[in-house]
């Protein structure tokens, strides 16, 4: 049966800065085809259990699948197909009219970096503990990878890390993000964002843990020296981090231009697309270079801020220079200045 389980099956994820997330295209017969999200009897708004696409993520040398569902922005390449039968089967597909096709999106975890962990092994004179010390980031259900409450485990003991806002811990946070193979530290998360409040019906492993740690050495270079055990606090903050490797990233598109390589910039917040408002923190072309790359266009030719005379013009705002650093977009309900970007078109 011809399906994404076939060992020779080829897929790729396009229209994103990462090879591990984007619009699903498959090689079939004569070339690459975009897969419509209406395939296999699904509706264009339906989200699937992503684990069914684990073979695709694996073949792309990415981690486990995080989401499988409508990509919400459809770029139609030369060809799009709707397939029938079981999910992931390509035995019975037909060409779709491009205006009828909503593309299927897949997000897989970025691959783990193959650099050796920064934790040094304990000196050979000490007995080996039952398990080496390790970290875990616990996100909200359906939350992001590389973002969440930090839990530290040493042997059989595990718990959150007490954190005071005045703690000067930048080096430690970089070390922790790096140890988690999540890149570098971006910012602290408020606990509501990080998902500390637990649903009473949650599985046992996500219930609050019985012990807590305090930062002992913010310049530590091996995990066993970073924290010391304390009595659990009823109140107070716990350490919650956002690292640069967070996923899924903000997606962008260009609309209203004469090709997919020019137009007003829109970004996606959840299932909604909205205009990206101009930001004083992004006056350089870096942000727009990244947007052009995501559309698979060449470098930026020009960008101009459109006048926001209309007090009712709404949109989304990213406070960082690059969209890839934006873990959340803020709503702007008035005077949103849109930006019109023109990228080089690789296929003029």
């Amino acid at each position: 049966r011809l399906s994404w389980y076939d060992p020779d099956f080829q897929a790729r994820l396009t229209r994103s800065n990462s090879k591990c997330q984007g619009q699903l295209e498959v090689y079939l017969k004569d070339g690459w085809h975009m897969v419509c999200s209406q395939s296999w009897g699904r509706s264009s708004k339906q989200w699937e259990d992503p684990s069914q696409a684990s073979k695709v993520c694996q073949r792309l040398n990415c981690g486990v699948p995080l989401s499988l569902g409508p990509f919400l922005v459809t770029y139609t390449p030369q060809s799009s197909i709707i397939c029938y039968g079981q999910l992931g089967s390509f035995s019975n597909c037909s060409h779709s009219r491009n205006d009828m096709c909503h593309s299927l999106g897949l997000t897989c975890l970025e691959p783990q970096k193959t650099t050796p962990p920064t934790t040094r092994p304990p000196p050979t004179t000490t007995p080996e503990p039952t398990a080496p010390p390790r970290l875990q980031l616990v996100a909200q259900s359906g939350g992001q990878h590389c973002a969440g409450v930090v839990e530290f485990y040493s042997g059989s003991l595990g718990g959150t890390i007490s954190y005071e806002a005045q703690d000067k811990t930048q080096d430690l946070e970089n070390f922790l993000c790096n140890n988690l193979q999540c890149g570098s530290f971006l910012k602290h998360l408020p606990e509501t964002e990080a998902g500390r409040a637990q649903d009473p019906g949650e599985p046992r492993e996500h219930q609050p843990l019985p012990i807590q740690w305090k930062i002992q050495n913010s310049s530590c270079t091996s995990l066993e020296h970073c924290f010391r055990k304390i009595k659990p606090q009823k109140s107070g903050r716990v350490l919650a981090l956002l690292c640069s490797g967070f996923q899924p990233k903000v997606q962008s598109r260009l609309v209203g231009g004469s090709s997919i390589c020019e137009g007003t910039v829109e970004v996606r917040q959840g299932a909604q697309w909205a205009a990206l408002c101009d930001s004083s923190s992004a006056r350089s072309s870096l942000r727009w270079e990244e947007v052009c790359r995501e559309q698979q266009c060449g470098s930026v030719n020009s960008y101009r801020v459109l006048d926001a005379g209309d007090p009712t013009s709404r949109g989304l705002f990213c406070p960082h220079q690059k969209l890839s650093q934006c873990h959340e977009l803020w709503e702007r309900n008035s005077y949103c200045k849109k930006v019109f970007v023109t990228c080089q078109d690789p296929n003029p």
Epitope: Y27, L28, G31
Partner: antibody, heavy 120, light 106 residues
């Protein structure tokens, strides 16, 4: 094991229609993902893809030959036929029957080829 | 139509030599490239597909690499039975072949 064998006329007159048949074994054109096609090679020259037919009756033709080509299959007989109309001396070549899978694994099995000469 | 420019058109090498044949596509073909070996009076045989995957039974001295527009077939240690003409093939959009490289023993 997979085998493909071409059959058809050795000599065809200009303006006539060339009909070639490929008989294969070791796989079925009813199996999803399977395709059979034709590639030709003029004497002392390179390879030129001609046409392909897939398990689901989808057909693809070389754009430069499309107007003169028809490819059909009879899956129950394990045969694929190619018709090339209005032949000229430029169509003189060894015609190979080839198998290909939809996943893009190249032309993985080839027939021995049959030399067709177009001459009056 | 995508044009595949293959070079050299012929080359002479000694047994044990490392041999490299290149193919350049007129536009980006990703990794949808295959390589074939054709010995005199025989039909071509598939060596490599998807740029670097060896077909069943192909010796590991044959390796393929590249992506986008530039592709290479390498024979790490030339054997007498490798004397043949080699063709590249792109299948990113329809199918086109390189003009061939005739490999001879010095």
């Amino acid at each position: 094991q997979v085998t493909l064998k071409e059959s058809g006329p050795v000599l065809v007159k200009p303006t006539e229609t060339l009909t070639l048949t490929c008989t294969f074994s070791g796989f079925s054109l009813s199996t999803s993902g399977m395709g059979v096609g034709w590639i030709r090679q003029a004497p002392g020259k390179g390879l030129e893809w001609v046409a392909h037919i897939w398990w689901d009756d989808d057909v693809y033709y070389n754009p430069s030959l499309k107007s003169r080509l028809t490819i059909t299959k009879d899956a129950s007989k394990d045969q694929v036929s190619l018709k090339l109309s209005s032949v000229t001396a430029a169509d003189t070549a060894v015609y190979y029957c080839v198998r290909r899978r939809a996943t893009g694994t190249g032309f993985d099995y080839w027939g021995q080829g049959t030399l067709v000469t177009v001459s009056s | 139509n995508i044009v595949m420019t293959q070079s050299p058109s012929s080359l002479s090498a000694s047994v044990g030599d490392r041999v490299t044949i290149t193919c350049q596509a007129s536009q980006d073909v990703g990794t949808a490239v295959a390589w074939y070996q054709q010995k005199p009076d025989q039909s071509p045989k598939l060596l490599i597909y998807w740029t670097s995957t060896r077909h069943t039974g192909v010796p590991d001295r044959f390796t393929g690499s590249g992506s986008g527009t530039d592709f290479t077939l390498t024979i790490s240690s030339l054997q007498p039975e490798d004397i043949a003409t080699y063709f590249c093939h792109q299948y990113n959009s329809y199918n086109t072949f390189g003009s061939g490289t005739k490999l001879e023993i010095k």
